[in-house]
Interface confidence: medium
């Protein structure tokens, strides 16, 4: 009769370990229309063989509590359910299952889930994708104001997302060591939604130039979560009939050095 020789398994199934590591703090942000790579790292106790593994990416939208498939890869085939979605097979060999999405739109924000199968094991991780749009800002004078010595200045921010934005007005007189926030004669209009889901807003400052010192610097400051530092636009009151006839378009970030020199 035959003796069956059982080979000793060096690694038992209990020793196999599969983990998925997502972006720290579980949140990633990208700008509207940019390309984003959503991070997903596969950690496996053995060298990876991509022909025997599967990757599926899902998105749960912020508005509908429903998951949709974005991309899948199984050994011999891959399919993008969202145009342009891609996982690099070259990088997958070294455990990088990150999903690349070109031209991200606002509605693509939500929870992304990376599901990895290395038979018989399965692991998954989730990350929130935030999509933001930076405001384009400009400062101009309302030419319709015809009262002598009175000027109405408009600071307009357009095509930003999300909706929350903070617009303030400040002034510097020549001798003041710091700037001062202006709260009087400031009206900030309602936030208006554009067709593409972004928002616009305008803030108005009314000035009586006969009561202001020539040389005073006025500044409109825009703060929004898409901006690393506030955007600021300055104008200088040069004479009683100060005018900014040409709209002063800008997307300038505020400049400035560190606190104290030396």
């Amino acid at each position: 009769h035959h003796h069956h020789h059982h080979e000793q398994k060096l690694i038992s199934e209990e020793d196999l370990d599969l983990k998925v590591e997502m972006m720290a703090r579980g949140i990633q942000a990208t700008r509207l229309n940019d390309s984003v790579t959503i991070s997903c790292k596969v950690i496996y106790s053995q060298p990876l063989n991509i022909t025997s593994m599967g990757i599926t990416w899902f998105r749960k939208s912020l508005t509908l509590d429903k998951e949709v498939k974005v991309f899948e890869f199984f050994g011999d085939h891959q399919k993008a359910f969202r145009p342009g979605a891609n996982v690099s097979l070259w990088r997958l060999k070294s455990g990088d299952a990150s999903l690349k999405l070109p031209g991200v739109q606002l509605e693509e924000a939500g929870e992304y889930r990376c599901e990895v199968v290395v038979t018989p094991l399965k692991a998954q991780g989730t990350v929130q994708l935030k999509v933001v749009a930076s405001p384009t800002s400009r400062l101009f004078q309302d030419q319709a104001v015809v009262k002598e010595n009175e000027g109405k200045y408009m600071c307009e921010s357009s095509r930003f997302y999300p909706k929350d934005i903070n617009i303030t007005w400040e002034k510097w007189t020549q001798k003041s060591p710091h700037h001062v926030v202006i709260s009087e004669n400031v009206i900030t209009g309602p936030t208006i939604k554009n067709m593409d889901g972004t928002f616009n807003i305008t803030s108005y400052l009314k000035l009586n130039s006969s009561q202001e010192d020539p040389g005073t610097v006025y500044r409109c400051v825009i703060r929004h979560e898409s901006l690393h530092t506030p955007v600021s636009i300055d104008f200088i009151l040069t004479a009683p009939q100060q005018s900014l006839s040409e709209p002063e378009k800008t997307d300038i970030f505020s400049s400035g050095g560190g606190g104290s020199a030396g």
């Epitope: 003041s176 710091h178 700037h179 050095g257």
Partner: antibody, heavy 117, light 107 residues
Framework: QVQLVQSGAEVKKPGASVKVSCKAS????????MNWMRQAPGQGLEWMGG????????DYNEKFKGRVTMTVDTSTSTVYMELSSLRSEDTAVYYC??????????WGQGTLVTVSS | DIQMTQSPSSLSASVGDRVTITCKAS??????VAWYQQKPGKAPKSLIY???NRYDGVPSRFSGSGSGTDFTLTISSLQPEDFTTYYC?????????FGAGTKLEIK
């Protein structure tokens, strides 16, 4: 990058005068107001006065009127602060300071003036 | 001249504590108040302008409030580098005047 570089430490005898310089770089020099502050050892801050950098306006603290003179050399972007009739209580670190931007105002590194007989 | 009365003159606290420094102006200064931090041997560094606005780069644990005559600087959770001296300053009118300072020490 705005920089304010001050002259070195000075030791003076009572009754003498001292002239501290502050050289500015990194911005349009003439369109700002420059202030001078001082700080006696272990004490708080005291405003001495200021000068508009085009050189046409000064504002002095009453406490120092008659003893302090602030001047500007626009060709070298340098501001000077001269304090006369020095006494021991004028021993202090003197700072020039300029209104800043979103990171705060700019200060020179300070000049220690010691008045001692 | 406008007097700025700062209190306390010194304060002992521990890392992680919330501390409040107050400054009282002898007359109405609106919101024209700034706060400075000064480390030994260094020039002061601006923290707050217009009573409650943080300069860029200043950690969010620093906050200012008040208007008129009463102002406060609050540090919500003290870090080791915060143990130094703080000054308030009014800039509504000349002469510019400062508080006498508050020295923050480790308990």
């Amino acid at each position: 990058q705005v920089q304010l570089v001050q002259s070195g430490a000075e030791v003076k005898k009572p009754g003498a005068s001292v002239k501290v310089s502050c050289k500015a770089s990194g911005y349009t020099f003439t369109s700002y107001w420059m202030n001078w502050m001082r700080q006696a050892p272990g004490q708080g801050l005291e405003w001495m006065g200021g000068i508009y950098l085009s050189g046409d306006s000064t504002d002095y603290n009453e406490k120092f009127k008659g003893r302090v003179t602030m001047t500007v050399d626009t060709s070298t972007s340098t501001v000077y602060m001269e304090l006369s009739s020095l006494r021991s209580e004028d021993t202090a670190v003197y700072y020039c300071t300029r209104r800043g931007d979103y990171f705060g105002d700019f200060w020179g590194q300070g000049t220690l003036v010691t008045v001692s007989s | 001249d406008i007097q700025m009365t700062q209190s306390p003159s010194s304060l002992s606290a521990s890392v992680g504590d919330r501390v409040t420094i107050t400054c009282k102006a002898s007359q109405n200064v609106g919101k024209y108040v700034a706060w400075y931090q000064q480390k030994p041997g260094k020039a002061p560094k601006s923290l707050i302008y217009s009573a409650s606005n943080r300069y860029d780069g200043v950690p969010s644990r620093f906050s200012g409030s008040g208007s008129g005559t009463d102002f406060t600087l609050t540090i919500s959770s003290l870090q080791p580098e915060d143990f130094t001296t703080y000054y308030c300053q009014q800039y509504i009118s000349y002469p510019l005047t400062f508080g006498a300072g508050t020295k923050l020490e480790i308990k």
